[in-house]
């Protein structure tokens, strides 16, 4: 077999098929893969952001001067391997995933920076980076050990419109409460003072400067 040093888990992922059940994986272990093995490195663990975005670097040890490379992200969960996304790129050019792909990426030499978006808690799993050197021949295949991506769904936030209504209601309530309070206070003050009451202002003589107490004009009611 040409793929010397090809590990067991690599053999089970050699075909670019969308979903492989457990039985097919078992069967593929016994199919010889006639290609050269290539080392692929990727981080062991990555935690997705609260927005469901996970990024990791996939690095491959290119044995030759590849001009065309194909990168595939596979997800392994519950003994099933699913193709998440794939992109073929010419060396020196940008990675181009399909328009509806959840993946984006950039390449730099033998490194591919992959970003997977729209992840949810149910998408937690082992994400495997598969690299194929498509041209020139011979064909080389490398499959990483996988990156365990953990996705934690954020606490469900109330609807923004609902929040707006609550804010409006509270504000209105406070406004009417303060208005009512003011009205009540004014009415009490007015009740204490009879509208027929008359009085005079008596201006008291000014105090000495050294005197600390200051007298202000005050209201004297006249019966």
């Amino acid at each position: 077999m040409a793929c010397l040093g090809f590990q067991r888990h690599k053999a089970q992922l050699n075909l670019a098929t969308r979903t492989w059940p457990c039985t097919l994986l078992f069967f593929l272990l016994f199919i010889p893969v006639f290609c050269k093995a290539m080392h692929v490195a990727q981080p062991a663990v990555v935690l997705a952001s609260s927005r469901g975005i996970a990024s990791f670097v996939c690095e491959y040890a290119s044995p030759g001067k590849a001009t065309e490379v194909r990168v595939t992200v596979l997800r392994q969960a519950d003994s099933q391997v699913t193709e998440v996304c794939a992109a073929t790129y010419m060396m020196g050019n940008e990675l181009t995933f399909l328009d509806d792909s959840i993946c984006t990426g950039t390449s730099s030499g033998n490194q591919v920076n992959l970003t997977i978006q729209g992840l949810r808690a149910m998408d937690t799993g082992l994400y495997i980076c598969k690299v194929e050197l498509m041209y020139p021949p011979p064909y080389y295949l490398g499959i990483g050990n996988g990156t365990q991506i953990y996705v934690i769904d954020p606490e469900p936030c109330p609807d923004s419109d609902f929040l707006l209504w609550i804010l409006a209601a509270v504000s209105s309530g406070l406004f009417f409460y303060s208005f009512l309070l003011t009205a009540v206070s004014l009415s009490k003050m007015l009740k204490k003072r009879s509208p027929l009451t008359t009085g005079v202002y008596v201006k008291m003589p000014p105090t000495e400067p050294e005197c600390e107490k200051q007298f202000q004009p005050y209201f004297i009611p006249i019966n």
Epitope: A2, A16, M134, P137, P138, Y139
Partner: antibody, heavy 120, light 107 residues
Framework: QLQLQESGGGVVRPGGSLRLSCTVS??????????WGWIRQPPGKGLEWIGN???????YYNPSLKSRVTISVDTSKNQFSLKLSSVTAADTAVYYC????????????WGQGTLVTVSS | DIQMTQSPSSLSASVGDRVTITCRAS??????LAWYQQKPGKVPKLLIY???TLQSGVPSRFSGSGSGTDFTLTISSLQPEDVATYYC?????????FGGGTKVEIK
Amino acid sequence: QLQLQESGGGVVRPGGSLRLSCTVSGGSISSSSYYWGWIRQPPGKGLEWIGNIYYSGNTYYNPSLKSRVTISVDTSKNQFSLKLSSVTAADTAVYYCARRRIQLWSFDYWGQGTLVTVSS
Amino acid sequence: DIQMTQSPSSLSASVGDRVTITCRASQGISNYLAWYQQKPGKVPKLLIYAASTLQSGVPSRFSGSGSGTDFTLTISSLQPEDVATYYCQKYNSAPLTFGGGTKVEIK
């Protein structure tokens, strides 16, 4: 059963262009596991690789023919085509379309071939 | 470009004979070699790939060996239906090139 069928063969004038199509049946040309290619064989001579194409449109050509060759794919019709420009008598051959697996650069399925004669 | 040279260019053998065809590469090509059979007026058929792996459906009397620059295709017991021209093809680098062919006939 996978079948490949070439069409468009016949007589082409020197300096003109030959255009051949290969229709794939019994399988999808959009399979990510295969490449599709053209090989030719001049009468009584050996085989010569012309080029390959992937369903996404990526192409590889024989450097000796690269300046004159264009291979294209039409996934909606499940077919791929060959255009060879500025033909001479040396381009007279049976043209085969074929399939190869991604992992291998050998051809496991071949069409029946179509003869192209370059003559005035 | 790497040149592929086949020998002999033609041979004649009796039914049941062991037949050996050689293919030599001008540079080492590891085991990136395939063998094809083309019967008169027919389409080439893949027999062996990766120098020694038999394509499914190919009779076990066909076998391939070799690595680097020297390769052989062996027909352990020649049958009348084996009358054909055999081509080797290297695929370690671009361009893919074929050998000149070896024509096998029955005595």
